[in-house]
């Protein structure tokens, strides 16, 4: 049997289920990559007229699991928010992706009549804030 | 989002009971002793990432537009991930062994999608 662990402070031990995005913990190669994208490239230029382009971030990298056998449980602190869902489970291969609930919108000017009239709209869930192995 | 039923290998939500006793957390998590946390698994073919409800966001749509045009932004993988999570009430000891009852966010995977 394994030796008793030092006292695992409660909710932060949830990092096994809910690792905060700032922690590269065990997945240093899962990161955010920036890309300058024009709406023309996307074929959306007839709809979105401004901005013509934006800095798009996506998540890139591997998520090899290497949890030490006697995982030291974390230090005190409030349960992480934004938090990460359970994924270290049978059959669930962690994946480097944008953390759900942390995507930000992009504010754009759009047209639906070829540029006669304009609307200010919000494209939801477009800007990646955090990447994590989930 | 799809529910895993054993008949699909597409991105779906697999029901899964997390037993705190089995993972040795029953010394600080007082209640519940376990819960259905669930998880996401399955493949995310390119066509699925564009399907509303299967795609997690506009972000996915952007990446997918790139893929369909053969433009590969750093070989972005399409991932089966939680797209909807819910809160669970928990009773636990804090670092000074005071008892805390708290609604902990993002504990339960409700839906999965491709990102």
């Amino acid at each position: 049997s394994t030796p008793p662990m030092s006292w695992p402070w409660s909710p932060s031990a949830l990092r096994l289920l809910q690792r905060p995005p700032e922690e590269p913990a065990a997945h240093a190669n899962c990161h955010r990559v920036a890309l300058n994208i024009s709406f023309q490239e996307l074929g959306w230029e007839r709809w979105i007229v401004y901005p013509p382009s934006f800095i798009f971030h996506y998540c890139h990298g591997g998520c090899g699991l290497h949890i030490p056998p006697n995982l030291p449980l974390p230090v005190p602190g409030a349960p992480p928010t934004p938090a990460q869902p359970p994924s270290l489970l049978p059959g669930a291969q962690p994946c480097c992706a944008a953390l759900p609930g942390t995507m930000r919108p992009l504010h754009v000017r759009t047209t639906s009549d070829g540029g006669y009239s304009f609307k200010y709209e919000t494209v939801p869930n477009l800007l990646t804030q955090h990447c994590a192995c989930i | 989002g799809l529910e895993c039923d054993g008949r699909t290998n597409l991105c779906c939500r697999q029901q899964f009971f997390i037993d705190f006793r089995l993972i040795g957390w029953n010394d600080w998590i007082i209640a519940p002793t376990g819960y259905y946390g669930n998880y996401c698994e399955g493949s995310c073919p390119a066509y699925l990432a564009g399907v509303p409800g299967s795609a997690s966001s506009f972000h996915t749509a952007v990446v997918n537009q790139y893929r369909m045009r053969g433009l590969n932004p750093g070989a972005v993988n399409s991932c089966c991930i939680p797209t909807k999570l819910s809160t669970m009430s928990m009773l636990y000891f804090d670092d000074e062994y005071n008892i805390v009852k708290r609604d902990v966010p993002n504990m339960i995977v409700e839906e999965c999608g491709c990102a």
Epitope: M5, W7 | R21, G24, N26, D27, A31, Y97, K101
Partner: antibody
């Protein structure tokens, strides 16, 4: 049924140590915290500390941190409390008690041992 | 630590009488984490009322508990001979867990 067995009495000399035992049966030993409570003759109850048999995690009342040590032997479903450098102030009945779930997030010391009477005397 | 003060320390009541004893906490305690234990001479304490107002298994319905914050009470609607023992209040909201000094109930 749940039972917590404790020896009836221990007679020890001042300055010596004593190791009290509490053998559990009738439930899944590793699922419940075990508490220790002190009661001096004619006095009230004092919480000493607690141990979780699954992990060996312990928490002590600051007052007893140096004088009491809680340990567990999973194989025999027994928890122990060692009291060291005993003085007459340590003469008391020591109870072990299971901390159990009453439903709806309610917990309490639901089963108690009969207590071990410790007498410190030369 | 949270100090629990029970009053009175000793009280007498006639059989059939209504009895109320109180427990005052030095700082607020959640009602979920407040219990009462009964102890007969020479015996271990027994859980009597849990989470302020819930009677433990086998406890007669003449007993009741109430309170919140820093003030809690145990009431016996009609005192019976077997009730003449000691009652301890207990909190496990804040560590270290503490007990009151006890109220010894005697027959008048």
């Amino acid at each position: 049924q749940v039972q917590l067995q404790q020896p009836g009495a221990e007679l020890v000399k001042p300055g010596a140590s004593v190791k009290l035992s509490c053998k559990a049966s009738g439930y899944t030993f590793t699922n419940y915290w075990m508490y220790w409570v002190k009661q001096r003759p004619g006095q009230g109850l004092e919480w000493i500390g607690m141990i979780h048999p699954n992990s060996g995690s312990t928490n002590y009342n600051g007052k007893f941190k140096t004088g009491a040590t809680l340990t567990v032997d999973k194989s025999s479903s027994t928890v122990y409390m060692q009291l060291s450098s005993l003085t007459s102030e340590d003469s008391a009945v020591y109870y072990c008690a299971r901390w159990g779930y009453g439903g709806n997030y309610d917990y309490a010391m639901d089963y108690w041992g009969q207590g071990t009477s410790v007498t410190v005397s030369s | 630590q949270i100090v629990l003060t029970q009053s009175p320390a000793i009280m007498s009541a006639s059989l059939g009488e209504r009895v109320t004893m109180t427990c005052t906490a030095s700082s607020s305690v959640s009602s979920s984490y407040f219990h009462w234990y009964q102890q007969k001479p020479g015996s271990s304490p027994k859980l009597w009322i849990y989470s302020t107002s819930n009677l433990a298994s086998g406890v007669p319905a003449r007993f009741s508990g109430s309170g919140s914050g820093t003030s809690y009470s145990l009431t016996i609607s009609t005192m019976e001979a077997e009730d003449a023992v000691t009652y301890y209040c207990h909190q496990y909201h804040r560590s270290p867990w503490t007990f009151g000094g006890g109220t010894k109930l005697e027959i008048k």
